[in-house]
């Protein structure tokens, strides 16, 4: 899996007037890393994981960069014509990656009110946009603004590609991201669903990287997809991830079911605990 740095900037307008605030979130290898909020822009490490590694740094450089990016995006939003009444958002997502073979990728995507309308490959400078007329109008609007000073734009986007990669390399060198494997803790619980049935939930937590296989098996055979419910794989704030899978089974058949977990080449199975029902709640309505 490549190392990645992802910037997510959002600015808002109300009745055509661009708001002064903005929100920037930065993810490093999929982990929430920095956040620059509306009222007081301070690039802050997200969670102990990021804070521990870079110690007593003030993050002033990151704060400056994120503030500058927010101002740029506000100016872009101000140039979007025909903004209707009410609340609107312009979002810019910028991603750069360094792959195992040292090749790089960089891209940038613009969303208006949550809808993608313009993308750019920051290496080839190639623009793409969806076919809808609204997206095309927005895209032309934004591209024209960005191209007003062609030279500046060229420099700006080269810099964005180079800066993103430079920052990513700097973080990797600092040891913020280590190619590490942290195995999950797996916990199986049961709760009453309806008469004669129980819901069994298998939770995996504290694992890294995020790729994991978690599923229920009956007599050693995986259950079909539609009989299981999965939770998203979410960061837990400690530089690791958590997720869950649940299924409904007949009471008395618990011993036939196991939770199967596979992570970073290791796998294990976990039985349903016997005994009385622990939690009186249902995952499924």
């Amino acid at each position: 899996e490549p190392h990645s740095l992802r910037y997510n900037l959002t600015v808002l307008s109300w009745d055509g007037s661009v708001q002064s605030g903005f929100l920037t979130e930065v993810h490093l290898d999929g982990q929430p890393f920095l956040r620059c909020d509306r009222q007081k822009c301070r690039a802050k490490p997200q969670g102990q994981w990021a804070e521990d590694v870079l110690g007593n740094k003030t993050w002033d450089r990151e704060t400056r960069d994120l503030t500058g990016n927010g101002k740029d995006l506000r100016m872009t939003l101000a140039h979007i014509k025909d903004q209707k009444e009410g609340l609107h958002s312009l979002q810019e997502i910028r991603v750069c990656e360094i792959h195992e073979d040292n090749s790089t990728r960089s891209s940038q995507h613009f969303y208006y009110d949550g809808e993608l309308f313009l993308s750019q490959n920051l290496e080839t400078k190639e623009w793409t946009m969806p076919q809808s007329s609204r997206a095309q109008t927005l895209a032309m609007n934004v591209r024209n603004f960005l191209k007003e000073d062609a030279m500046k734009t060229k420099t700006h986007y080269h810099a964005m590609h180079a800066d993103c990669l430079q920052e990513l390399r700097r973080y990797l060198k600092s040891g913020v991201v280590l190619r590490r494997t942290v195995p999950p803790m797996v916990n199986v619980t049961r709760s009453e669903a309806s008469e004669g049935n129980i819901t069994v939930t298998c939770r995996a937590s504290g694992f890294y990287p995020w790729n994991i296989t978690l599923s229920w098996r009956q007599d050693g055979v995986s259950l079909s997809h539609d009989t299981q419910q999965w939770g998203d794989v979410l960061p837990d704030g400690n530089g690791t991830y958590q997720t869950w899978v649940a299924t409904r089974i007949c009471q008395g058949e618990e011993q036939r079911f196991t939770c199967y977990m596979e992570h970073s080449g290791n796998h294990s199975t976990h039985p349903v605990p016997s005994g009385k029902v622990l939690v009186l709640q249902s995952h499924w309505q």
């Epitope: 009222q39 007081k40 822009c41 301070r42 007593n56 740094k57 003030t58 993050w59 002033d60 450089r61 704060t63 400056r64 503030t67």
Partner: antibody, heavy 118, light 107 residues
Amino acid sequence: QVQLQQPGAELVRPGASVKLSCKASGYSFTSYWMNWMKQRPGQGLEWIGMIHPSDSETRLNQKFKDKATLTVDKSSSTAYMQLNSPTSEDSAVYYCAREMGPYTLDYWGQGTSVTVSS
Amino acid sequence: DILLTQSPAILSVSPGARVSFSCRASQNIDTSIHWYQQRTNGSPRLLIKYASESISGIPSRFSGSGSGTDFTLSINSVESEDIADYYCQQSNYWPLTFGAGTKLELK
């Protein structure tokens, strides 16, 4: 125009806490961090800490964590620094300063000269 | 804490001369250095931010350079109103720290 008003001087008894004020005007008080510095006679500047008036988030220099308490009163656009258990070592000029961008101080008060003496 | 060493402690110059102040950091601080001027009995005034970025309202004779550990503030033609103490401040690491200052005086 931006102004930070501080009283000129304070005479304090050793051990008796003192609360220094810094009244801001000419800008949106809740949008900028306020920093506090110490300068002893004939010496350089020391950074004590910072507070953000919007939510009173503070960051203190560990050296001053038991010595200084930072607070704000949004209604009067005033920042305060309380000096706890002052000794002669705390005799100095104390400045408040507004932060313009990350950690750069663009407007300074005139400073309050604190003398700790019995 | 990051130690900022300013040299020399005192600089004597003639009006119209070019002068440079040095600030050396005890470790790499990128370009996170800011320069202040403090006249006698006055408050510090921001001159340069982030090593070389100018501040509105500050005369163009003031300039800054450097990155990493070595930084310089220059005045390309000293005027009598420039007589003051000059401090550098770093903002790359907690706590924020200032140098001990350089006093500029006229010959």
